[in-house]
Amino acid sequence: QKSSIEKCSVDIQQSRNKTTERPGLLNCPIYWQQLREKCLLFSHTVNPWNNSLADCSTKESSLLLIRDKDELIHTQNLIRDKAILFWIGLNFSLSEKNWKWINGSFLNSNDLEIRGDAKENSCISISQTSVYSEYCSTEIRWICQKELTPVRNKVYPDS
Amino acid sequence: QKSSIEKCSVDIQQSRNKTTERPGLLNCPIYWQQLREKCLLFSHTVNPWNNSLADCSTKESSLLLIRDKDELIHTQNLIRDKAILFWIGLNFSLSEKNWKWINGSFLNSNDLEIRGDAKENSCISISQTSVYSEYCSTEIRWICQKELTPVRNKVYPDS
């Protein structure tokens, strides 16, 4: 049974004007870089893919999601060292035998040319020039993203 | 090599006044419920624990982190059906043989009375009345959280 205070709090929240603008980020936080409508955090430390996912999540952000080749190239332009790899939000789904973004969508095969195997425990990293399949347990850097622009009436229905 | 446009964008961003207030969330988004200083999203669909973690991340949020017994009880008061389980951001770390929150901290044994085994591939769910250890591959609902209050110059020191 909900306490009356909790019920009231929820009722008030749910009855609020649903078109209120949620402010979003006006500037990127310290350590983050702006790239178009996103703020990106390029880690300096290293982590396995799962820990990288969790780190972005606890920063209320997401492992990087790349829409298309153009966004990939612009992101790679921000990587200063050729030898460094960064985890992004894409890994191999064994049950669906396909590369799957952490938002649940599947990779469009034209978007990224992946070097390496598509198999269990494979996660995707990017470098300044390429996209690689790596063992998800490998400790490398990672990229978190936050949306920069205020979004009016953003709904997040239910993935 | 950064393109001149990208370099400019990054330089401008990095030279901004670093003490600008980042607004945070002023209201909870639609479908999210306010509970004290958090916004909570109780999913309607079901997912394994890993997918739930990823889903919260892509919503720029985190699987629920519960500070203490009081917060657990208040969260449980928002669950309307006794029979429904929700993943939270706590799973069993085999290497450390302990329950571990996704922010890296370990469970204080006094906080939650867990029903079920502490073993490999175990993740924690909550119901209206209890806290359960479940196989992480089980498909159940989940709870995401966002911090509600505006934070001045937040650098995410202790995510």
């Epitope: - | 670093k18 890296g104 901290s105 202790d158």
Partner: antibody
Framework: EVQLLESGGGLVQPGGSLRLSCAAS????????MSWVRQAPGKGLEWVSA????????YYADSVKGRFTISRDNSKNTLYLQMNSLRAEDTAVYYC??????????????WGRGTLVTVSS | DIQLTQSPSSVSASVGDRVTITCRAS??????LAWYQQKPGKAPKLLIY???ALQSGVPSRFSGSGSGTDFTLTISSLQPEDFATYYC?????????FGGGTKVEIK
């Protein structure tokens, strides 16, 4: 209370070994990369070694490579530095240090009080 | 390794003075520079990170600027408690390196 507390320092002969420990409390230790930094008497700060949050990646200054080993036990919230083949120039106060953000190696916002290691015959 | 050169190595100043310390990196480190204050027998204290971000709890008389290879720490009005040694540190690449330090002494 948020703190780091080093222990294990002392007097040791050249060629000898010591193991330093750093007990962390008040923050989520397992989420952060950690470092050891040292300071010889009357000298500046010198970074010695770093370890990733999960402990699988370690890094060393050239001056200690092959002689020192950094490790951590996240279940005990403890950082270690095993120092072998010690030399007179290793004499210093050794600090453990935590970075401000979990994505960074440095920008150390939390330091221990330090433990003195003296290498002398 | 990236070398950091601090100047001056020492400076004599009076309470109320404006003090400026510079740090030059041997290669581009973007904004990955921090400044620390250290008093005798104590651990260093983080003042500035990411070149210009003031660490929580640090007085606003401290400020940092610069990017690339040239950085500056400024104390706008020196207070008695500010007499100490100041170090810059780069956080761009491993190994992490520190400048040689600048001692701020009472004139």
């Amino acid at each position: 209370e948020v703190q780091l507390l080093e222990s294990g320092g002392g007097l040791v002969q050249p060629g000898g070994s010591l193991r330093l420990s750093c007990a962390a409390s008040g923050f989520t230790f397992s989420q952060y990369a950690m470092s050891w930094v040292r300071q010889a008497p009357g000298k500046g700060l010198e970074w010695v070694s770093a370890i990733s949050a999960v402990g699988g990646s370690t890094y060393y200054a050239d001056s200690v490579k092959g002689r020192f080993t950094i490790s951590r036990d996240n279940s005990k919230n403890t950082l270690y530095l095993q120092m072998n083949s010690l030399r007179a120039e290793d004499t210093a106060v050794y600090y453990c240090a935590k970075p401000l953000d979990s994505s960074q190696w440095a920008d150390f916002d939390l330091w221990g009080r330090g433990t003195l290691v003296t290498v002398s015959s | 390794d990236i070398q950091l050169t601090q100047s001056p190595s020492s400076v004599s100043a009076s309470v109320g003075d404006r003090v400026t310390i510079t740090c030059r990196a041997s290669q581009d480190i973007s904004s990955w520079l921090a400044w620390y204050q250290q008093k005798p027998g104590k651990a260093p204290k983080l003042l500035i990170y990411a070149a210009s971000a003031l660490q929580s709890g640090v007085p606003s008389r401290f400020s940092g600027s610069g990017s690339g290879t040239d950085f500056t720490l400024t104390i706008s009005s020196l207070q008695p408690e500010d007499f100490a040694t100041y170090y810059c540190q780069q956080a761009d690449v491993l190994p992490i390196t520190f400048g040689g330090g600048t001692k701020v002494e009472i004139k």
